[in-house]
């Protein structure tokens, strides 16, 4: 569990209501790990942040990210539940003023310092593929997900619904 103080420091408003509303409906801090329990860590190197996928030592502290949940203002196109619920998008921020971004040209996931309103590249549609796992689909490139490739985060194209459970796009969120 975590205290509100850490979350309050990061509370931000998003002013582009056409994307996902004025402000997040919920925010909380969590650590991010892969399906195989490797940790996603963030390190400041040469004035920019690098993202690593690595095994932590036994008592090493996990990095936390602020997950901010936004309701889409547009009804989902999917068949099934339709307007019964608004699709949720998330932004992920490991430190103040930095957000995970999808670089679709380079098929990479990067940390960018940016002004509000946040660009579309910072938003990811949240999926539950597997019991306690989530996946993050690029708002800017449907069918492309954050995944793990060569011990780094990358953008991975998922061609069919059968591949939605592929382990390299599954992540675990933990508050401990």
């Amino acid at each position: 569990a975590f205290g509100i103080s850490g979350v309050q420091k990061y509370t931000r408003a998003l002013h582009d209501s056409s994307i996902t509303g004025i402000s997040p409906i919920t925010e909380y801090l969590a650590s991010l790990s892969t399906y195989n329990d490797q940790s996603i860590t963030f390190a400041l190197e040469d004035e920019s942040y690098e993202i690593y996928v690595e095994d932590l030592k036994k008592d090493e502290k996990k990095d936390k990210v602020l997950l901010s949940y936004y309701e889409s203002q547009h009804p989902s196109n999917e068949s099934g539940d339709g307007v019964d619920g608004k699709m949720l998008m998330v932004t992920l921020s490991p430190t103040k003023d930095f957000w995970l971004h999808a670089n679709n040209k380079e098929h990479s996931v990067e940390l960018h310092k940016c002004e509000k309103p946040l660009p579309d590249q910072a938003f990811f549609v949240l999926h539950n593929m597997h019991s306690n796992c989530v996946s993050f689909e690029c708002k800017t490139d449907p069918g492309v997900f954050i995944g793990v490739k060569d011990n780094h985060l990358a953008l991975i194209k998922v061609d069919s619904s059968e591949n939605l459970c592929t382990e390299n796009i599954l992540f675990k969120l933990s508050e401990t």
Epitope: F2, I25, M87, L88, L126, N128, S131, V134, E175
Partner: nanobody
Framework: QVQLVESGGGLVQPGGSLRLSCAAS????????MGWHRQAPGKQRELVAV???????NYADSVKGRFTISRDDSKNTVYLQMNSLRAEDTAVYYC???????????????WGQGTLVTVSS
């Protein structure tokens, strides 16, 4: 479809306590979090408390130390124990859940109809 049904609201004197409940039902595959928001007359809806599937909690500063959120995963139910209630806690309290259903992996936000809490002497 996912339905959220709140209960437990009512009239209480300042300093008193209430316990709100919210039960989720329907074709729920997974629940990412369940939480409570409130909306006082003429004000914007605000987050009160949230509990995640992993057990993490987050509270608004104004209720920290007075309100406690908890969950019962087996019943897909979330509770809000409200103690030391104040007049400024008067509002409609809404349950909110982030969940995916068996018809889609996409996580969606679902809301209850709200339950009125009035704190007055």
């Amino acid at each position: 479809q996912v339905q959220l049904v709140e209960s437990g609201g009512g009239l209480v004197q300042p300093g008193g306590s209430l316990r709100l409940s919210c039960a989720a039902s329907g074709s729920i595959r997974t629940v990412n979090y369940m939480g409570w928001h409130r909306q006082a007359p003429g004000k914007q809806r605000e987050l009160v408390a949230v509990v995640t599937s992993g057990g993490g909690t987050n509270y608004a500063d104004s209720v920290k130390g007075r309100f406690t959120i908890s969950r019962d995963d087996s019943k897909n139910t979330v509770y809000l124990q409200m103690n030391s209630l104040r007049a400024e806690d008067t509002a409609v309290y809404y349950c909110n859940a982030a969940a995916s259903t068996y018809s889609s992996t996409v996580v969606r936000s679902f809301w209850g109809q709200g339950t009125l809490v009035t704190v007055s002497s």
